[in-house]
């Protein structure tokens, strides 16, 4: 629970707690903002981001954004609050332990985004459909 000597709320700046009233600690995410990338036509890629940050807010999750246009490929790694849109998209998969890329419609470029909620989960970005939980073999592995 929140220690009694820690102020619980001032100026609406709440201390985030879990369902049991314990202080919710933030997760760790790769956080290199936008970097050029060589990740292309692969089932999965490592971020090659050397910076692991403690997210600023306990409710934030890890996000990765892969973009390809006529000139270059970039990979963005950040923390972000899933209640807020990112690049105008809702983080639908924020509770996932893995960062499984989903394509989003953006004019003039190929745009994939994923979010996840385990430490440094945006270090390994997954494009392959075989990682989708609709795959019955994967479900079998999960429940064994």
């Amino acid at each position: 629970t929140i220690p009694p000597h820690v102020q619980k709320s001032v100026n609406n700046d709440m201390i985030v707690t879990d369902n049991n009233g314990a202080v919710k600690f933030p997760q760790l995410c790769k956080f290199c903002d936008v970097r050029f990338s060589t990740c292309d036509n692969q089932k999965s890629c490592m971020s090659n981001c050397s910076i692991t940050s403690i997210c600023e807010k306990p409710q934030e999750v890890c996000v990765a954004v892969w973009r390809k246009n006529d000139e270059n490929i970039t990979l963005e790694t950040v923390c972000h609050d899933p209640k807020l849109p990112y690049h105008d998209f809702i983080l639908e998969d924020a509770a996932s332990p893995k960062c499984i890329m989903k394509e989003k419609k953006k004019p003039g470029e190929t745009f994939f985004m994923c979010s996840c909620s385990s430490d440094e989960c945006n270090d390994n970005i997954i494009f392959s459909e075989e990682y989708n939980t609709s795959n019955p073999d994967l479900l079998l592995v999960i429940f064994q």
Epitope: D18, N20, A22, V23, F25, L28, I54
Partner: nanobody, 122 residues
Framework: EVQLLESGGGLVQPGGSLRLSCAAS???????QMWWVRQAPGKGLEFVS?????????YYANSVRGRFTISRDNSKNTLYLQMNSLRAEDTAVYYC???????????????WGQGTLVTVSS
């Protein structure tokens, strides 16, 4: 009984340095994940730094990266935070905290010290 006792806070000028200590007792210090967490006046908690055990991997918030260094001395049961290039916005009560998984996925036992006040002002 688990106890965490912070020390080393005080008044320092902008650009100055301080070293905080957290003396731990009542548990096996060398096996625990340890954190420094701060609370500025009128603000919520900010999670500044974490050090894991075993391995001693360290992590920082973007706001302190390159200025603060977390370390531990398991033989002395003590956690440290070396704070350099201090700024007015670093003014806060600094707590050390330990986290241990309960065994139930995603849940933890937390223990907190009483905190030490750091004031950065000219």
């Amino acid at each position: 009984e688990v106890q965490l006792l912070e020390s080393g806070g005080g008044l320092v000028q902008p650009g100055g340095s301080l070293r905080l200590s957290c003396a731990a007792s009542g548990f096996t210090f060398g096996t625990e994940q340890m954190w420094w967490v701060r609370q500025a006046p009128g603000k919520g908690l900010e999670f500044v730094s974490r050090i894991d055990s075993p391995g001693g991997r360290t992590y920082y918030a973007n706001s302190v990266r390159g200025r603060f260094t977390i370390s531990r001395d398991n033989s002395k049961n003590t956690l440290y935070l070396q704070m350099n290039s201090l700024r007015a916005e670093d003014t806060a009560v600094y707590y050390c905290a330990k986290r241990r998984p309960t065994g139930v996925s995603g849940t933890f036992y937390d223990y907190w010290g009483q905190g030490t006040l750091v004031t950065v002002s000219s």
